[in-house]
């Protein structure tokens, strides 16, 4: 006899990285017929929704209208059908960004390199942080973590055309509180024409939508949860 229901999916809209004082919605998708959803934050009950009519609803939304460092951390959700509870969802790491300062991102030997050259990114932030994150725009979740007193280096090694794209970095004050993003650095890797055509760039987006698509895209996530790449989330753990 089944003792628990399948775990629900949990995600954040527009994104799990939320600028401070901005709104975020935590979505929990379970099953039609669920009479209760519970959202837990850092292990404690945070919110409850009892959708009506339950047979017509399989997703609930928990709003956080004003993101701040107290609201950043790990969330999970569960749901109930009758008296039977689900397994808990995976953990959602909600990160508050735009805290304190803006790092500077630079690249050596430069933003335009030839395939096979060794490339290193440098992220510098003069305030009290020792952890840095380098992120490449797009859904592929290219994330690296680096350490240093005021600067971290991110060696990419010999690059290929797959490395081309737009990069930003953050200083991390703790796992769930990050700085403003650096200005973007676009890495252009030139190679022979055949190779270039085989390595399409990650999707490009207007610069002002940075926060809504970094690491993953809301639409892709909603259409198919299997598309969610856990690289960035796992990095936080």
């Amino acid at each position: 006899q089944q003792q628990t229901l399948p775990k629900p999916f949990i995600w954040a809209e527009p994104h799990f990285m939320v600028p401070k004082e901005k709104q975020v919605t935590i979505c929990c998708q379970g099953n039609y017929g669920a009479v209760e959803y519970q959202l837990h934050f850092e292990g404690s009950l945070f919110a409850v929704d009892r959708p009506k009519p339950p047979e017509r609803i399989n997703k609930v939304q928990f709003y956080i209208p004003d993101m701040n460092s107290r609201m950043a951390g790990q969330y999970s959700c569960i749901y109930r059908v009758g008296e039977l509870w689900s397994e808990p969802s995976n953990l959602l790491d909600l990160v508050v960004t735009e805290m304190y300062d803006t790092p500077t991102l630079s690249v050596h030997p430069g933003p335009e390199v030839i395939s096979g050259e060794k490339v290193t990114f440098y992220c510098r932030l003069d305030t009290a942080t020792s952890m840095f994150l380098l992120l490449k725009e797009g859904r592929s979740s290219h994330v690296q973590r680096g350490y240093g007193k005021v600067q971290a280096e991110f060696p990419l090694g010999p690059v290929t055309t797959a490395h081309r794209g737009t990069y930003r970095c953050f200083g991390s004050y703790n796992n769930h509180a990050w700085s403003f993003p650096s200005e973007p650095v676009k890495l252009l890797v030139t190679g022979d024409i055949e190779n270039t055509s085989l390595a399409p760039e990650d999707p490009t987006f207007p610069a002002d939508t940075w926060g809504t698509y970094l690491l993953t895209t809301e639409t892709g996530l909603q259409k198919d949860h299997a598309l969610w790449d856990h690289t960035a989330q796992n990095l936080l753990r």
């Epitope: 919605t25 934050f41 945070f46 919110a47 929704d49 009506k52 609930v60 956080i64």
Partner: nanobody, 130 residues
Framework: EVQLVESGGGLVQPGGSLRLSCAAS????????MAWFRQAPGKGREFVAA????????YYADSMKGRFTISRDNSKNTAYLQMNSLRAEDTAVYYC???????????????????????WGQGTLVTVSS
């Protein structure tokens, strides 16, 4: 901006009843989930009960279930906490709270964590003693 003012506290004997009121100013009150919390002397803040903006969904701390009833009248911009079968351990300052007012909340959602609440009243003291 929402301002909250509690009233109805006082001294009551064990087994007695009290009804607390929370009057809100601000046009958005009727769209905001609300809750009552309490803080006993020398202790931390504790969740008591929560209610959705529509009033159609409520949630209670286990120790208050069956004794306390949360309700609201959006036409009067007021929330209530009816407390029955009061015990000495219910002695505390009772606070009402409302969530931030910039989101379109579900009509059935309640928040149980104090960190979710942006607006707080000044509190009203309830003393249960013989």
């Amino acid at each position: 901006e929402v301002q909250l003012v509690e009233s109805g506290g006082g001294l009551v004997q064990p087994g007695g009843s009290l009804r607390l009121s929370c009057a809100a100013s601000g046009r958005t009150f009727s769209r905001l989930p609300m809750a009552w919390f309490r803080q006993a002397p020398g202790k931390g803040r504790e969740f008591v009960a929560a209610i959705s903006w529509s009033g159609g969904s409520t949630y209670y701390a286990d120790s208050m279930k069956g004794r306390f009833t949360i309700s609201r009248d959006n036409s009067k911009n007021t929330a209530y906490l009816q407390m029955n079968s009061l015990r000495a351990e219910d002695t505390a300052v009772y606070y009402c709270a409302a969530v931030g007012d910039s989101a379109p909340y579900s009509a059935t959602i309640v928040y149980t964590d104090a960190r979710a609440y942006a607006y707080w009243g000044q509190g009203t003291l309830v003393t249960v003693s013989s």
